[in-house]
């Protein structure tokens, strides 16, 4: 059975022609019976997002080399396996590179869901707090307090994928004054607009505002965590919420202090310091792996306050997902 698997020739590491490794040699997989359940397992094994398609492998450039072998005739997964190696497989008896299988998982870095290109919160701690700036004709402009409302702040927070607006009427501190042109004032949002640019406003650049009237908005950064797959809310595989998406945490560097912070944040008492075997009984996750190399002192009130790599940066698979068991 294959000892390694990869996707070759796609836009990103989570898409491409399927290649498996056997005895140190990389070869392709025939697409006989290849379907979305097989791709789901492959995506899970690679730590990619959900399966999004089963494209023909021969579309990917460059094509498989002539001397490369087709190593597997067919794969038959139920969709619940952790790796392709756990699925039923047939050895090759009749297949050419014209039938190479392809796979497409959700790209961890992008999607056709809109990215908030036209608004940002600048000079704040994180992307959900800061001075409101809006992009117009490739130039960033600040927004004047005049006419600003809770409804406008709601629109900004929603547009940025942040939580609810918690601070809306504050002016910027001197050190956070903008240096950009002042965009406009008299924003009159209903609160239902998709973007700030959809709100009626005064004309671009025509106002009598100063930078000491620049608007500062704070939204809840929707960080949250949960334990899934356990008998209760205080045990299970750890998942964290970031930018509205749940994802797992890699166990690199994970230990007692990190356990304690999670249990504390969830109001679940103390960590029961589970064994490696106990931690593994909750199985691997799917989708995003959000955090890696988490380091806590144990004093933090929230896992978010612990040190960790940038969100989404990791070198892990879902086999390394953290699980935590608290006293409850």
């Amino acid at each position: 059975s294959p000892s390694g698997v990869r996707l070759v020739g796609g836009l990103h590491r989570c898409e491409g022609r399927v290649e498996v490794e056997q005895k140190g040699q990389w070869g392709t997989v025939c697409d006989d019976g290849w379907d979305i359940k097989d791709v789901a397992v492959l995506c899970r094994e690679l730590g990619c997002g959900a399966a999004s398609g089963t494209p023909s492998g021969i579309l990917y450039e460059p094509p498989a080399e002539k001397e490369q072998k087709v190593l597997i005739q067919s794969v038959s997964c139920t969709g619940t396996e952790d790796t392709l190696a756990q699925c039923e497989q047939e050895e090759v008896y009749d297949c050419s590179h014209d039938e190479d299988a392809g796979a497409s998982c959700e790209n961890p870095e992008s999607s056709f869901s809109p990215v908030p290109e036209g608004v940002r919160l600048a000079d704040g701690p994180g992307h959900c707090k800061g001075r409101v700036e809006v992009k117009h004709q490739n130039q960033w402009y600040t927004v004047c307090q005049t006419g600003w409302s809770l409804r406008a702040a709601k629109v900004v927070c929603r547009q940025l994928g942040c939580g609810r607006a918690v601070l809306t009427q504050k002016r910027c501190n001197k050190h956070a004054y903008g240096r950009k042109p002042i965009w406009l004032s008299q924003m009159s949002c209903s609160g239902r607009e998709a973007t700030l640019q959809d709100c009626p406003s005064g004309p671009w650049g025509k106002n009598t505002c100063n930078h000491d009237e620049d608007t500062w908005v704070e939204c809840e950064d929707p960080f949250d965590l949960r334990l899934v797959g356990g008998d209760n809310l205080c045990s299970g595989r750890l998942e964290v919420l970031h930018k509205g998406v749940w994802g797992s945490v890699c166990d690199d560097n994970w230990g007692e202090k990190e356990d304690q912070v999670v249990c504390k944040q969830l109001g679940c008492g103390k960590s029961l310091s589970p064994s490696f075997r106990d931690r593994k009984c909750y199985g691997p996750g799917v989708g995003r792996i959000w955090l890696d190399n988490v380091r806590c002192s144990g004093e933090e009130q929230s896992l978010e306050q612990c040190q960790h790599r940038f969100w989404g940066f990791h070198d892990c698979t879902h086999q390394e997902d953290v699980a935590v068991i608290c006293s409850g």
């Epitope: 836009l11 898409e15 697409d31 089963t54 494209p55 014209d98 392809g102 056709f112």
Partner: antibody, heavy 117, light 107 residues
Framework: EVQLVQSGAEVKKPGASVKVSCKAS????????MHWVRQAPGQGLEWMGW????????NYAQKFQGRVTMTRDTSISTAYMELSRLRSDDTAVYYC??????????WGQGTTVSVSS | DIQMTQSPSSLSASVGDRVTITCRAS??????LNWYQQKPGKAPKLLIY???SLQSGVPSRFSGSGSGTDFTLTISSLQPEDFATYYC?????????FGGGTKVDIK
Amino acid sequence: EVQLVQSGAEVKKPGASVKVSCKASGYTFTGYYMHWVRQAPGQGLEWMGWINPNSGGTNYAQKFQGRVTMTRDTSISTAYMELSRLRSDDTAVYYCAGGRIDAFDIWGQGTTVSVSS
Amino acid sequence: DIQMTQSPSSLSASVGDRVTITCRASQSISSYLNWYQQKPGKAPKLLIYAASSLQSGVPSRFSGSGSGTDFTLTISSLQPEDFATYYCQQSYSTPLTFGGGTKVDIK
């Protein structure tokens, strides 16, 4: 809003070249292939090729090999398609279409290219 | 190159009718087939991918079936906004190729 906005109509003489642009907004430009498809007046659709906006790698239909060049500028999320040695039967609407390697999820509004002497 | 043949090339139907369009490939393409809708003066729109998967936002009255060489697009109950031209497209190998189109107009 996810959209592709193409450059305006062009009128060209036979033998000339045309370069059509396609600006993406509302999504991660490098996250999807950009295909080019054309449609002659009253005719069906014809795939010309794709560009991988990440790497700049291309795959052209054999029919257009040697005459078509697809490029991109990731800093402005824009793809380009240049067709050289134009003939009258290149008169068509040229579409850019973003999506998977095997399907065209979102389309530009189209650019009319007229070739006549 | 893989040739895609659509039939009929045009059909007339009434609102509420069940409409079926077929597409045949010159060789087996497994389930690597997509369907598009195009209205006059507009860009095409993806309806169905991988032979039977409904693209997000497309009404459920559209469905696709088939594998190998023969495929079908069905509109279960034709609506006024469905009068358009429909194209199939194979995604088995490059060059990606389209059928000649089926124009659905009002009876």
